[in-house]
């Protein structure tokens, strides 16, 4: 299980109204469901049920984005429309350059993602849990512009930085 180093850059409004940035570093794991590649893009939060919809007319994003999916407790969705792997595939089909799963409430998903596949995705599929997942979701839930960069090697920076 290889470590994925994730840098999340949050673009916020400063008191002057212009953009300022806050960078947070966290770690996850590359799953066998995808490729061990670097990726970078704007974060798009996706609800697990939102990935069930297979409407071909649904807008595909026209740029590389990083899908973030917080998985729910299995009891809340006893008959899921797709497996976790299927959800990752659906996100990549829609244009995701990478998918990050928060598996804190569904740790069984780790085994599903690591079962391996004869046809793994060509984009990284990362999972996070615990404190790292909390940090990620706190940023995502702000519903502001945030970008994620996923790397196989640790970044050379300190992980907390304020630009004023």
């Amino acid at each position: 299980k290889e470590t994925a180093f994730v840098e999340v850059v949050l673009f916020e409004s400063s008191p002057s109204g212009d953009y300022t940035t806050h960078t947070t570093g966290l770690t996850g794991r590359f799953s066998r469901a995808g490729a061990m590649l670097s990726a970078e893009g704007e974060i798009v939060q996706m609800h697990p049920l939102g990935l069930c919809n297979n409407n071909d007319e649904e807008d595909l994003y026209e740029y590389g984005w990083v899908g973030v999916v917080k998985l729910e407790q299995p009891e809340l969705d006893p008959k899921p429309c797709l497996t976790v792997l299927g959800k990752a595939k659906r996100a990549v089909q829609r244009g995701a350059t990478a998918v990050i799963f928060d598996v804190s409430e569904n740790p069984e998903a780790i085994d599903q993602l690591n079962q391996g596949s004869e046809d793994p995705l060509k984009r990284p599929v990362v999972y996070v849990k615990g404190a790292d997942a909390i940090k990620l979701m706190n940023i995502v839930n702000k519903q502001k512009v945030a970008r994620a960069r996923i790397q196989h090697l640790p970044p050379r920076q300190p992980t907390e930085y304020f630009d004023m």
Partner: nanobody, 121 residues
Framework: QVQLQESGGGLVQAGGSLRLSCAAS????????MGWYRQAPGKERELVAG???????NYADSVKGRFTISRDNAKNTVYLQMNSLKPEDTAVYYC???????????????WGQGTQVTVSS
Amino acid sequence: QVQLQESGGGLVQAGGSLRLSCAASGTISYAHIMGWYRQAPGKERELVAGISQGSITNYADSVKGRFTISRDNAKNTVYLQMNSLKPEDTAVYYCAVISYDYIKSVPFRYWGQGTQVTVSS
């Protein structure tokens, strides 16, 4: 490197409308946020509006409800629809691309040449 070409400025009466356009070319993958800034004579350059690749927008308080920013990712173009213009909106309007330098941990900007917007009373 990113090149930006603005158009759409001009002279308009108070209460009127204008639509600014800005086409980006070059390394467009850097265009994390595209936005419009303005600089009135004797004042600092200020953000008017910005929009991310995923269409998350940010507006200056002074233009909320009057200006609308939009973006066409396929054409690498950003637009600023300006309605109910006021004399205090008179300024040079600059298109900008805001990106992020992961090595230095700082955002950086590419600027257009600017287009003059004059609102007469």
